[in-house]
């Protein structure tokens, strides 16, 4: 028996009542040690116990009036009072007492963290941790095995196992994502350590296998056949090839490479969207040079971990046959342009040079030539250019011609080339005065005075610099009034050979001058220099002679 520490008069046993009882249960008895059994004491419950518990007022027996659920409430704290009915007063102070609800195994284990999902790499070794599941049991863990749980695998063999006491799920057999990528595992949790009468609960775990790069890409076609026109420009797509990889995502990203292409004519790039290999033309092809190509292409993954490298040895290859299709191509001149030289003055019909164009195609069509750009030339069937007129370098030193070659088998196929004809100089022009000289001598000129400086020009082209030679004509015997001196620099001076001239005696002198060039053979011209006598006055300057001469000619005398 227990006694209340504060109130020594109360006596009761520890109260325990089982949960889940369908009938009224006797819990125990409260009594006061002052109670002598003469039925004058009355027992009362106060407070919270009113609904679930009742007390026999005469005996102090306590009863559970309804089914109790330990998992809802495991302890009840009640207050009791004892009254002596003869005097109508409490004989003991109010006291609290406790009723404990004892556990029965009425709750199954429950998985509270559902849904369970786990991801684990494919081909993970045995023993790899996948996920831990935990079941909770609401029963009293201190009451026998009511809340002692064991786990077992209901579905998932042979790939998974569960540790019975921890709920840790591990891999028990390697799995290949490419065969199956999702697994459904069912775990059962039993209380009572699985003994008879145990309650159980189950949960489902969805386990996804993540991809590892354990598959290399493989060409489904062992070879491909493409055709390309020889007129296709570089950069043209020839065709597309495709390898397949059972992996996904980054592990399926692949790279194509050309293994053997000595010609370096093809390239391959990847279409990142479709993972196709696009074969492109890197350099133009020429049917006449090579019309069949073969290239071997290798495919490999872009991202391969070192430990998975063994799965990627002996990369898959495919062979591509490329057939070049012939295009009728225009003629090709043997040179990009032609430069010919011909001396001027040659008779018409003189051969200038020969151009030549060929058909690059196999049929080797003959050519027909035509020429535009000048009526001075013509071209014959062999591509030989001839003159049709006398050429004069001093009229035109260069001719810019255009020659066209047309295939006789296909007149649509035409090409043209520039022909530059240089007319070479021959010495066919004698030198002459560089200008028309107005030369004057003053009446009061002194002997040896420079009357005029002269120079010459020559319409011929000079390989080096022209050199001119000046001489007073030997025919000009009657003219001793002037002398000529060659300066040896392509100029000469005319000097007065006497002192004083008179307008009354002679108004004008004509001096015959010979000018020779340095051509081979040299050419000489006869040139007349007119020297007019002028009244210069005291100044002895010829600056005003032109106007004076004009007035003189008009019949006036200038003072």
């Amino acid at each position: 028996d227990y006694k209340d520490d504060d109130d020594k008069g109360w006596v009761w046993k520890q109260f325990v009542v089982p949960e889940e009882m369908d009938t009224i249960q006797h819990v125990g008895r409260l009594r006061s040690d002052l109670d002598n059994g003469n039925n004058s004491f009355q027992y009362k419950l106060l407070g919270t116990g009113d609904g679930s518990f009742s007390i026999d007022e005469k005996t102090g027996d306590i009863f559970a009036m309804q089914k109790l659920d330990r998992e809802k409430q495991s302890l009840y704290i009640l207050r009791a009072q004892v009254i002596d009915t003869t005097i109508g007063k409490a004989v003991e102070p109010e006291s609290e007492f406790v009723i404990r609800v004892s556990d029965v195994n009425d709750n199954e284990p429950r998985f509270l963290d559902e849904p369970y999902e786990a991801i684990v790499p494919e081909m993970s070794p045995e023993g790899t941790f996948v996920i831990k599941v935990t079941a909770n049991d609401a029963d009293d863990p201190t009451s026998g095995y009511h809340a002692r749980i064991l786990y077992n695998l209901e579905q998932g063999q042979p790939y998974f196992s569960v540790e019975p006491t921890t709920g840790v799920i591990r891999i028990s057999s390697k799995m290949d994502r490419e065969l199956q990528d999702t697994y459904c595992v069912i775990i059962q949790a039993k209380d009572m350590l699985g003994q008879p009468g145990a309650l159980s609960g189950t949960t489902t775990i969805s386990i996804k296998l993540s991809d590892i790069n354990d598959n290399k890409p493989i060409f489904k076609e062992s070879f491909y056949r493409f055709t390309i026109s020889e007129s296709a420009p570089s950069g043209t797509t020839i065709g597309k090839i495709m390898a397949y990889d059972d992996d996904i995502g980054e592990n399926a990203e692949m790279d194509y490479s050309i293994e053997d292409d000595e010609s370096q004519i093809f390239d391959i790039v990847i279409d990142n969207e479709t993972q196709e290999g696009i074969v492109i033309l890197k350099k133009k092809v020429d049917f006449e040079h090579q019309n069949h190509y073969g290239i071997r292409v290798k495919v490999k993954n872009c991202h391969v971990d070192e430990e998975l490298a063994p799965a990627h040895v002996n990369a898959s290859t495919t062979y591509i046959k490329v057939q070049v299709e012939d295009e009728d191509e225009p003629p090709t001149f043997l040179l990009p342009y032609y430069i010919f030289e011909i001396p001027e003055g040659k008779p018409y019909g003189t051969m200038v040079g020969t151009v030549s164009a060929v058909d690059p195609d196999r049929r080797q069509s003959p050519m027909r030539y035509s020429l535009i750009g000048s009526k001075m030339f013509d071209i014959n069937g062999n591509g030989t250019i001839v003159t049709t007129n006398l050429l004069d370098r001093e009229v035109s030193a260069w001719y810019n011609l255009s020659v066209t070659a047309t295939e006789t088998y296909n007149v649509q196929q035409i090409s043209s080339a520039h022909v530059y004809v240089q007319v070479l100089n021959i010495n066919d022009h004698a030198p002459e005065f560089s200008q028309l000289y107005e030369t004057y001598v003053c009446e009061n000129a002194e002997s040896g005075e420079i009357i005029q400086t002269i120079s010459a020009i020559d319409r011929d082209e000079s390989i080096e610099d022209h050199h001119f030679y000046f001489n007073h004509s030997v025919e000009d015997t009657n003219n001793s009034s002037f002398i000529l001196t060659d300066n040896q620099d392509n100029t000469a001076v005319i000097l007065s050979n006497r002192a004083g001239f008179s307008l009354k005696e002679e108004t004008v002198f004509y001096m015959i001058i010979l000018i020779a060039d340095n051509g081979i053979p040299p050419l000489t011209s006869t040139n007349t220099l007119t020297i007019q006598v002028c009244d210069c006055g005291d100044s002895r300057s010829t600056e005003t002679c032109t106007s004076k001469e004009l007035l003189f000619i008009m019949g006036f005398k200038a003072e």
Epitope: F223, Y224, T227, E262, H292, G294
Partner: antibody, heavy 120, light 107 residues
């Protein structure tokens, strides 16, 4: 294993047209990527390629014979044929049909050949 | 067209000896575009080597090919009695042409 068999007349008169057929067995003539050729060998001489055809019907001929040659294909019969017009005695030869390889334009499979004599 | 020249025209050797057959092209060809054939009397040619060193299916390893550019070689390391016959080279880059052949006969 692909097998090829040539058939056709063994004697053709000058100026006429030589016609031969090659029947393919052990594989489809429509197999993607393969070219079907005709090759000839003059008696005691070397080999001369005549031309080839793809199952789609596109053909390519030896330029020196191009003006006289026609090669055609009949996929339903798994056959391809050669026609060589305006024949002369110089066309007397053993005619072979052949198929190229999967790794190049070499000739991997050959028929046993048929001798065609051009004579009046 | 590319012209192939084979030398020697005839090669006289004994069984067990090494045979070296040459094939020369009139202009450069990629080594990927050359093949060798064996032809026995009354039979069709038989592919030996392509590309120029890959052996065709069923070809014994005593046959090997090499070369590049314009010069190519077929080597038979130890001649067997059945190897005494005619050998042709073929280029398949610019159209298709064959060499005139080399005859290997028993000395």
């Amino acid at each position: 294993q692909v097998q090829l068999q040539e058939s056709g007349p063994g004697l053709v008169k000058p100026s006429q047209t030589l016609s031969l057929t090659c029947t393919v067995s052990g594989g489809s003539i429509s197999s993607s990527g393969y070219y079907w050729s005709w090759i000839r060998q003059h008696p005691g001489k070397g080999l001369e390629w005549i031309g080839y055809i793809y199952y789609t019907g596109s053909a390519y001929y030896n330029p020196s014979l191009k003006s006289r040659v026609t090669i055609s294909v009949d996929t339903s019969k798994n056959q391809f044929s050669l026609k060589l017009s305006s024949v002369t005695a110089a066309d007397t030869a053993v005619y072979y049909c052949a198929r190229d390889g999967s790794s190049g334009w070499y000739f991997q499979y050959w028929g046993q050949g048929t001798l065609v004599t051009v004579s009046s | 067209e590319i012209v192939l020249t084979q030398s020697p025209g005839t090669l006289s050797l004994s069984p067990g000896e090494r045979a070296t057959l040459s094939c020369r092209a009139s202009r450069n060809i990629s080594s990927s575009y050359l093949a060798w054939y064996q032809q026995k009397p009354g039979q069709a040619p038989r592919l030996l080597i392509y590309g120029p060193s890959s052996r065709a299916t069923g070809i014994p390893d005593r046959f090997s090919g090499s070369g590049s550019g314009t010069d190519f070689t077929l080597t038979i390391s130890r001649l067997e009695p059945e190897d005494f016959t005619v050998y042709y080279c073929q280029q398949y880059g610019s159209s298709f042409t064959f060499g005139p052949g080399t005859k290997v006969d028993i000395k």
